[in-house]
Every structure is written in structure tokens, then in C-alpha cells.
Amino acid sequence: TPLGPASSLPQSFLLKCLEQVRKIQGDGAALQEKLCATYKLCHPEELVLLGHSLGIPWAPLSSCPSQALQLAGCLSQLHSGLFLYQGLLQALEGISPELGPTLDTLQLDVADFATTIWQQMEELGMAPALQPTQGAMPAFASAFQRRAGGVLVASHLQSFLEVSYRVLRHLAQP
């Protein structure tokens, strides 16, 4: 059933999430900037077809529209999406020495955000079953594919975070 913004989510949790989203957005932007500056891969829209052929998935947030937000479903989709991006970022490992530290920080920040969401779901008694394993992740056959994949994963993640931020900000409104 839909739950409005006056739901049972503590303000401290929502503010922590908003903080974490902005931290990850900063990490993601730094990765995008380095991919652009180092490899001239600056326009994710030019790589969409390659993204289809590589099988880079999107994470849905269909349970999170502000007009008919389903709290349990939305938090679950947020967590599942973050779990998906952990796997996608893992698949990018070894992208290049220059990008390694930025990618490492992004990976950990995404994992920490997933922890925050799960922790809150657990406290509300709505924690989902633990995902046993990651689904099939894209296999990058070349350095170019991995870098192009990096551009697309960072772009997808940023879109996911923008929606997440809007949802969380909506929930945080008194």
C-alpha cells in the first residue's frame, strides 16, 4: 500500500542517506571527469548501443514515485539497485591505474550506502532476504570496452542517484 512522506523513517536516517548520495555523486563525477580527461570518453549517449551489446543493466526505482510511494518496495529497490552497482563496479576493476583509487572509493561508498538502507529496513522489520549471489555481470573483452563500460556504469549510477535523492528529499520533508 502507498505510504506518504509522513512514513516511519527517522529524519536522521534520511539525512544520512542524502549525505551519502551526494558523496557517491561526487565520486561518480570524479570518475566521469577522469575518463573524459584521460581517454576522451566524455559522452555516455554516444555509447548507448555499446552498452546494449555489453549487457549493462539499469536498476529500476518503479516503487519510488512520490505520488504513490511504497516504502518497503522503494527501500528494497534502492538496496537492490545499490547491490547491482556494486557488481558492475567490481566488473570494472583494473580499468586503469589512474582511475583505480577513484573507482575503489566509489565502490566502498556504494557498499556503505547499501548498508545504511539495509540497516534501516532491518530496524523497521522489513529487511529483504539476502541476495545469495550477483546476477550475470557484463564481461569486458578489451580495455576500451572496460573504459566505455565505466562511462556507462557511472552515467547509469548518476541517474539512479538523482532519482534516489529526489525520493529521499521528498521523504525528508516535514
Epitope: K16, T102, T115, Q134
Partner: antibody
């Protein structure tokens, strides 16, 4: 309540390997990252790396990439660190600490495992 | 890597008076989200470290309000308003803005 129980002290020869454990209780183990930190006698703290048990992903401080191997067993809620090709420089106390964000980061530590490397 | 710098020893303090411990980072720890990713830990003799302060100025659960922390993006100060015997130990600052996480060398609180 959260508790991290580390394995006992290890005495090893130069060139040998050791594997220590950190058993977690009081929380859902796979959800949190587990970090490992080194402290040489009378010295400061050095971050070695972390394991994300939910996806089995480990990340290392470059300095320890060829020294440490981090693993986790979800069924027993235990994180492991193996140290290889031991030298006297590896003689230290090694701590596990639970990861997280904000007030959760390193809010819980194991009691430490002392590794002594001696011929 | 971000380098965290601390003096090895504090100025000796008398019990009941205030003490300050400083820390400097080689890069600003202030993120664009407004959070400063600076932490303080205390390691008492023979014990594991414990979290005191997170995100530069927030007191961790169970930490007495005698402890406070402030700073800019690169220079930080931990203050203990009324030092007690149980405060003795080594104080470490640490950053978690980016990997690898790094710690300062630690400052030993000296009692007169």
C-alpha cells in the same frame, strides 16, 4: 550486541604464511564491510584493506596488495586475512573492524591478533 | 594517498584541566556534500582503538561531552575540557574521504 572475536596469537618463521580469523556476532554479517588494520609494536595504525562479504569483493591498500589476502565465509560469519612471505616487518597486532558510514565506521573492533615473525 | 600528521606527544596536562590535540591532513577532507571526513580514535593502553568523533565534530555514542572537535578542511583540533585519568592513551586522527583510509601517527596524552 556486536562482537568481533579474533583468533589467537601466531608465531611464524620468515617466509611462512599465517591465516587469522575474525568471527562476527550480534549483527547481519554480509551487510557490513570488514576492514583490517595493522599496528606494529609502539607504532601507529595502517589500513590494510576490506572485504565486502555480500559480493565477496576485497580491496587493498596498494602497500599490502602482495602481502594480504582477505576472504569471508558468510555461513560462519567469519572474515579471514592471510599474510604471506612473512618478514620481521610483518610482526604486528592485526585488528578487524566493522565498516559502515558516519557513526558506524570502525565503531566495533576485534581484540587484535598478535603475529610474531622470528627465525 | 592522503597524509595525516600529528605530534607524537601532547603538552603534559594536569588532571581537571583542558587538553588539545591537533592533526593536519595533506588534502582538504571537506567534501562537496558539506561533510568533513575526519575521525578521532582513542587507544587506551593494552586495548583496541575506540571511536570518539566522527565527521570532524560529532560525538560517537557513549563518549562523554568533555570531548569536542573542530577544524577547517585540513587542520583539526580535539579538545578535552576536563582531563580525567581514564583519558590517558594515544589519540589517532583518520580520514575516510577516499581510499586508502589513512591514520595519523597518534598523539600520546601526557599527564603531569
Amino acid at each position: 550486541q556486536v562482537h568481533l572475536q579474533q583468533s589467537g596469537a601466531e608465531l611464524a618463521r620468515p617466509g611462512a604464511s599465517v591465516k587469522m580469523s575474525c568471527k562476527a556476532s550480534g549483527y547481519t554479517f554480509p551487510i557490513y564491510t570488514m576492514h583490517w588494520i595493522k599496528q606494529r609494536p609502539g607504532q601507529g595504525l595502517e589500513w590494510i584493506g576490506y572485504i565486502n562479504p555480500s559480493i565477496g569483493y576485497a580491496n587493498y591498500n596498494q602497500k599490502f596488495r602482495d602481502k594480504a589476502t582477505l576472504t569471508a565465509d558468510k555461513s560462519s560469519s567469519t572474515a579471514y586475512m592471510q599474510l604471506s612471505s612473512l618478514t620481521s616487518e610483518d610482526s604486528a597486532v592485526y585488528y578487524c573492524a566493522r565498516g559502515g558510514y558516519g557513526d558506524s565506521l570502525f565503531a566495533y573492533w576485534g581484540q587484535g591478533t598478535l603475529v610474531t615473525v622470528s627465525a | 594517498d592522503i597524509v595525516m600528521t600529528q605530534a607524537a606527544f601532547s603538552n603534559p596536562v594536569t588532571l581537571g584541566t583542558s587538553a588539545s590535540i591537533s592533526c593536519r591532513s595533506s588534502k582538504s577532507l571537506l567534501h562537496s556534500n558539506g561533510i568533513t571526513y575526519l575521525y578521532w580514535y582513542l587507544q587506551k593502553p593494552g586495548q583496541s582503538p575506540q571511536l570518539l568523533i566522527y565527521q570532524m565534530s560529532n560525538l560517537a555514542s557513549g563518549v562523554p561531552d568533555r570531548f569536542s572537535s573542530s577544524g577547517s578542511g585540513t587542520d583539526f583540533t580535539l579538545r578535552i575540557s576536563r582531563v580525567e585519568a581514564e583519558d590517558v592513551g594515544v589519540y589517532y586522527c583518520a580520514q575516510n574521504l577516499e581510499l586508502p583510509y589513512t591514520f595519523g601517527g597518534g598523539t600520546k596524552l601526557e599527564i603531569k
